[in-house]
C-alpha cells in the first residue's frame, strides 16, 4: 500500500473549488522533495498539472496552487473555478518523476443540480437573509398566500398570510407585498442556518387554481480562506460582514471543538493569550473591521471566525467569515527577546528586527494600550516626533541595512511597564511585540553623571562626567545630545581607558564631555551610554540648562573645579590627556554593523543586531572631549 494518503473520492459542483490534502511519511527527504499533482491519462501517462517546483500547467493557470506544510507532513492542492472537464483520475505524489510515491484521487465535478423547470435557486451564506419571490395570477390576488418547505412528500408551512409562522422561523420569516404590486409576494427569511436549506414551495390560492413556485435554498457554510504565515510574523483578518450588522458588536473567535472561543470583541473582551499583541480596528461605518495579531506562535494555528452579534459572542444564524491559519515554523523573522526587564531610573535597549531588504523603510515604536479594542500609539519613529512625556528619554537608532534598529528608553518608571511593538511602513509581517517589565531599583544605577544639577553658563567651558563601573571597561562609552530626531553621538573622552583592566579602579572610570564655549543652543538633554559595536547597552540622561553669566560672578572653569576635587596625580594625568586628545572625534558608529551578544546588568544574554544613529556633532558648540 502507498505511504502517501489522501481523499480517494472528491466531489464538487461546477464553479466551486476544492482543497485536497495529501499526507506523506515524516522524513527529511520527503519534507524537501518535489510534490506534484498530475492527471492520469488513458495511456497510463500522468501529466503534471502543478508541482512544488513552481510548474503550473496552462489549464490550471490562475486557479490552482500547491502548498507544502513540512511541519504537518502534508501538502495541499487548491483548485478553483471547477468545470465538468475537471472530472477524472489524478495522483498526488512525491519525487522527481511522476512515477514516485503517489496516491490516486478521483475528482467528480457535477452540474448544479436540476430542479423542476420553474425552480429558482437562492444561494446564501449562513446568517444572511434571503428574499424569496412568489408570482401569482390576478385571480389569486385576494387568496391566502403561503410558503412551505418540502420534507419528503409533505410540505410544511413556514409562514402564511393569516400570520401563522412555524416556531422554528419565529422572528425570522416575514411575508409581504411591495407597493402596489398585484402579482407578486415576497418572503424574507433572515439569520439563515444550515437546516434552512432545501426545497420551498410558495403558493397563492387553494386547489387546482392555485399558483405555485418552487425555490431551492442553499445555505453555505463559510469557506475558510487559507492564510499561511511565518512564526513570529503577524496576520490581519479583514472582516466584512455587511451593512445589516454595522451596529452590532463585532468579534473574532477561534474554533475549539464545538465552540468558538472569543479572542477579542468590541465590548472589551480579550483572551489573555493575546494580551499585548492584538488590535481590533473598525474600518468604516458599514461594519467592516480588521483584527491584527502580531508575534505569531505555533499554537496560534487553527480555524478563526469573525462575526457580529449584540452580545459580542458567536450566535447561530448570524453572519460569519472564516479563515484557517497555518503558522510556518521555518520563519525568516529572527527570534528576539519577548520580555525585556529594567529597573526604575535605569534604561533598556530594545532591538527591533525588520526586513533587511527594506532598509529605507520608516521605523516606528508604539505602546500597546489595552483600552477597548486595543490601540498602539506611536511613541517614536524615524520621521516622527517623540511623544509628549518621552522627551529626553526615548530615541530610535537606525543603521540602514543591518536588519535591525534599536530603541532606547531611559529614566524608567514602573508606569513604563507594558507591551510595545516594533513596526515599519514596509513589510507588515515584521511586527514584533516586546513586554517591558520595570521593577523598583534596589541599588545605585551603573552609570552616574556629575554634576547632577547641570547648569552651563554661556561663553564658558562646561564639562560633565559620567562614571561607569569596571564591568563596562571594555565597552565603548559615548555621549550624545538628544533631539526629537534621535540622539546624535558626540566626540567624548574616556578617562578610564588609560588604565589596564587588571588594575581597574572603580572610582576613576569616567567618560566626560566638554562644551567649549557654551552656547544657548547647547541646552537640552544629554545621554551617557555604553555600547559594543552596534549593540547598545545602559544609558543615563541629564538635562543641561544654559544661562547667561550674571554680572560680578567670578569666572571659574568647571573643568578646573572638577579637577581640584580630585588628587593631584590624577589631575596631572587628566590635563595631559586633555591636551593629547584635544579635537579628536574617536567615535564613529557608522563603521560597525556586526552581530554580537551583550550581557547587561545581570540580564540574560540577548541576541541583537543593532545600529547607531550616526548623527553628527556639528550642531554642538566648540570641541567636546
Amino acid at each position: 500500500q502507498s505511504p502517501i494518503f489522501g481523499p480517494q473520492d472528491v466531489s464538487s459542483i461546477e464553479g466551486n473549488s476544492v482543497s485536497i490534502t495529501c499526507y506523506y511519511p515524516d522524513t527529511s527527504v520527503n519534507r524537501h522533495t518535489r510534490k506534484y499533482w498530475c492527471r492520469q491519462g488513458a495511456n497510463g501517462y500522468c501529466a503534471t498539472l502543478i508541482s512544488s517546483n513552481g510548474y503550473l500547467s496552462k489549464e490550471y493557470s490562475g486557479r490552482a496552487s500547491l502548498i507544502n506544510f513540512p511541519e504537518n507532513s502534508t501538502f495541499v492542492i487548491n483548485i478553483a473555478h471547477l468545470t465538468q472537464e475537471d472530472t477524472g483520475s489524478y495522483k498526488c505524489g512525491l519525487g522527481t518523476t511522476n512515477r514516485g510515491l503517489f496516491f490516486d484521487v478521483s475528482l467528480e465535478v457535477s452540474q448544479v443540480p436540476e430542479f423542476p423547470n420553474d425552480t429558482h435557486v437562492y444561494t446564501k451564506d449562513i446568517g444572511r437573509t434571503v428574499t424569496i419571490e412568489c408570482r401569482f395570477k390576478e385571480g389569486n390576488a385576494h387568496s391566502k398566500k403561503s410558503l412551505c418547505k418540502k420534507r419528503g412528500e409533505a410540505c410544511e408551512v413556514v409562514i402564511d398570510s393569516t400570520e401563522y409562522v412555524d416556531p422554528s422561523y419565529k422572528d425570522r420569516a416575514i411575508l409581504f407585498m411591495k407597493g402596489t404590486s398585484r402579482d407578486i409576494f415576497y418572503v424574507n427569511i433572515s439569520h439563515l442556518i444550515p437546516s434552512d436549506a432545501g426545497l420551498y414551495v410558495c403558493q397563492a390560492g387553494e386547489g387546482p387554481s392555485a399558483d405555485k413556485n418552487n425555490a431551492d435554498l442553499q445555505v453555505l457554510e463559510p469557506e475558510p480562506e487559507l492564510l499561511y504565515k511565518d512564526l513570529r510574523s503577524s496576520v490581519t483578518f479583514e472582516c466584512d460582514l455587511g451593512r445589516e450588522v454595522a451596529n452590532d458588536a463585532k468579534y473574532l473567535c477561534r474554533k475549539n471543538k464545538e465552540t468558538c472561543d472569543v479572542i477579542i470583541n468590541t465590548l472589551g473582551k480579550r483572551d489573555p493569550a493575546f494580551e499585548g499583541r492584538i488590535l481590533l480596528t473598525p474600518r468604516d461605518d458599514n461594519g467592516r473591521f480588521s483584527v491584527l495579531i502580531t508575534g505569531l506562535r505555533k499554537e496560534d494555528a487553527g480555524h478563526y471566525q469573525c462575526g457580529a452579534h449584540s452580545s459580542g459572542l458567536p450566535q447561530e444564524g448570524w453572519p460569519v467569515q472564516a479563515w484557517q491559519l497555518f503558522v510556518n515554523e521555518e520563519s525568516t523573522i529572527p527570534n528576539s527577546r519577548s520580555v525585556v526587564k529594567g529597573v526604575t531610573g535605569g534604561s533598556v535597549a530594545i532591538v527591533c528586527p525588520y526586513n533587511p531588504k527594506e532598509s529605507s523603510s520608516l521605523k516606528y515604536w508604539c505602546h500597546w494600550e489595552a483600552d477597548e479594542n486595543g490601540r498602539c500609539p506611536v511613541l517614536v519613529g524615524t520621521q516622527a516626533l517623540v511623544q509628549e512625556g518621552y522627551e529626553g528619554r526615548l530615541a530610535l537608532f537606525d543603521q540602514p541595512g543591518s536588519g535591525a534598529y534599536t530603541v532606547i528608553l531611559n529614566q524608567l518608571t514602573t508606569q513604563d511597564s507594558g507591551f510595545y511593538w516594533c513596526l515599519t511602513d514596509g513589510d507588515s509581517r515584521w511586527r514584533t511585540t516586546i513586554e517591558l517589565q520595570v521593577a523598583e531599583a534596589t541599588k545605585k544605577p551603573d552609570l552616574e553623571v556629575t554634576p547632577q544639577n547641570a547648569t552651563a553658563v554661556i561663553g564658558e567651558t562646561f564639562t560633565i562626567s559620567c562614571h561607569y563601573p569596571c564591568k563596562f571597561y571594555s565597552q565603548e562609552k559615548y555621549w550624545c545630545k538628544w533631539s526629537n530626531d534621535g540622539c546624535h553621538i558626540l566626540p567624548s573622552h574616556d578617562e578610564g581607558a588609560r588604565q589596564s583592566s587588571v588594575s581597574c579602579d572603580q572610582s576613576s572610570q569616567i567618560v566626560s564631555m566638554t562644551l567649549n564655549p557654551v552656547k544657548k543652543e547647547d541646552e537640552g538633554w544629554y545621554w551617557c551610554g555604553v555600547k559594543e559595536g552596534q549593540v547598545y547597552g545602559e544609558t543615563t540622561a541629564i538635562y543641561v540648562a544654559v544661562e547667561e553669566r550674571t554680572r560680578g560672578s567670578p569666572h571659574i572653569n568647571p573643568t578646573d573645579a572638577n579637577a581640584r576635587a580630585k588628587d593631584a596625580p590624577e589631575e596631572e594625568a587628566m590635563e595631559s590627556s586633555v591636551r593629547e586628545d584635544e579635537n579628536k572625534a574617536n567615535l564613529d558608529p557608522r563603521l560597525f554593523a556586526d552581530e554580537r551578544e551583550i550581557q547587561n546588568a545581570g540580564d540574560q544574554a540577548q541576541e541583537n543586531r543593532a545600529s547607531g544613529n550616526a548623527g553628527s556633532a556639528g550642531g554642538q558648540s566648540g570641541s567636546s572631549k
Epitope: 494518503f5 464538487s12 453555505l220 457554510e221 475558510p224 471543538k257 464545538e258 487553527g302 484557517q324
Partner: nanobody, 127 residues
C-alpha cells in the same frame, strides 16, 4: 452536549451487505469531519473511512482494506453519517465507532484527531 449514536450493526454472512448509521447532535455537523473506525479486542482502533465537507465539496477517505467495498456518506440536513458495507469478510468483524472532528485538525486516519466518539456498534461477519 455532543452525542454520536451508532446503529445498524448485527450478524451477517460473508459477502453480505450492511448499512451502519450514526446520528449526531450538538455539533456543527456540516463543518465537521466525520469518521468510522473499528476495533477488535486486544487491538488498537483502526481507521475505516471518513468524510469531510467544505463549501459544496465532499471529500471521502478510505483505508486500503475497504476501498471499493465500503462507501461513506453523510446527510447534512439530518445530521447523519452512513457507512454502506458490501462484500463483507470475516476480517471485517469488529466494533464500529463513529467519530467527529469539528476542527479538521491532523491526519484523518489518526484516532487522536477526533474529539467525539460514539459508543460503538458490533458487526460480526461469519464465514
Amino acid at each position: 452536549e455532543v452525542q454520536l449514536v451508532e446503529s445498524g450493526g448485527g450478524v451477517v454472512q460473508a459477502e453480505d451487505s450492511l448499512r451502519l448509521s450514526c446520528a449526531a447532535s450538538g455539533l456543527p455537523f456540516s463543518s465537521s469531519r466525520m469518521g468510522w473506525f473499528r476495533q477488535v479486542p486486544g487491538k488498537e482502533r483502526e481507521f475505516v473511512a471518513a468524510i469531510g465537507w467544505s463549501g459544496r465539496s465532499t471529500y471521502r477517505y478510505y483505508d486500503d482494506s475497504v476501498k471499493g467495498r465500503f462507501t461513506v456518506s453523510g446527510d447534512n440536513a439530518k445530521n447523519t453519517l452512513d457507512l454502506q458495507m458490501k462484500g463483507l469478510k470475516p476480517e471485517d468483524t469488529a466494533v464500529y465507532y463513529c467519530a467527529a472532528d469539528p476542527n479538521y485538525y491532523g491526519d484523518v486516519r489518526t484516532s487522536g484527531t477526533y474529539q467525539y466518539w460514539g459508543q460503538g456498534t458490533q458487526v460480526t461477519v461469519s464465514s
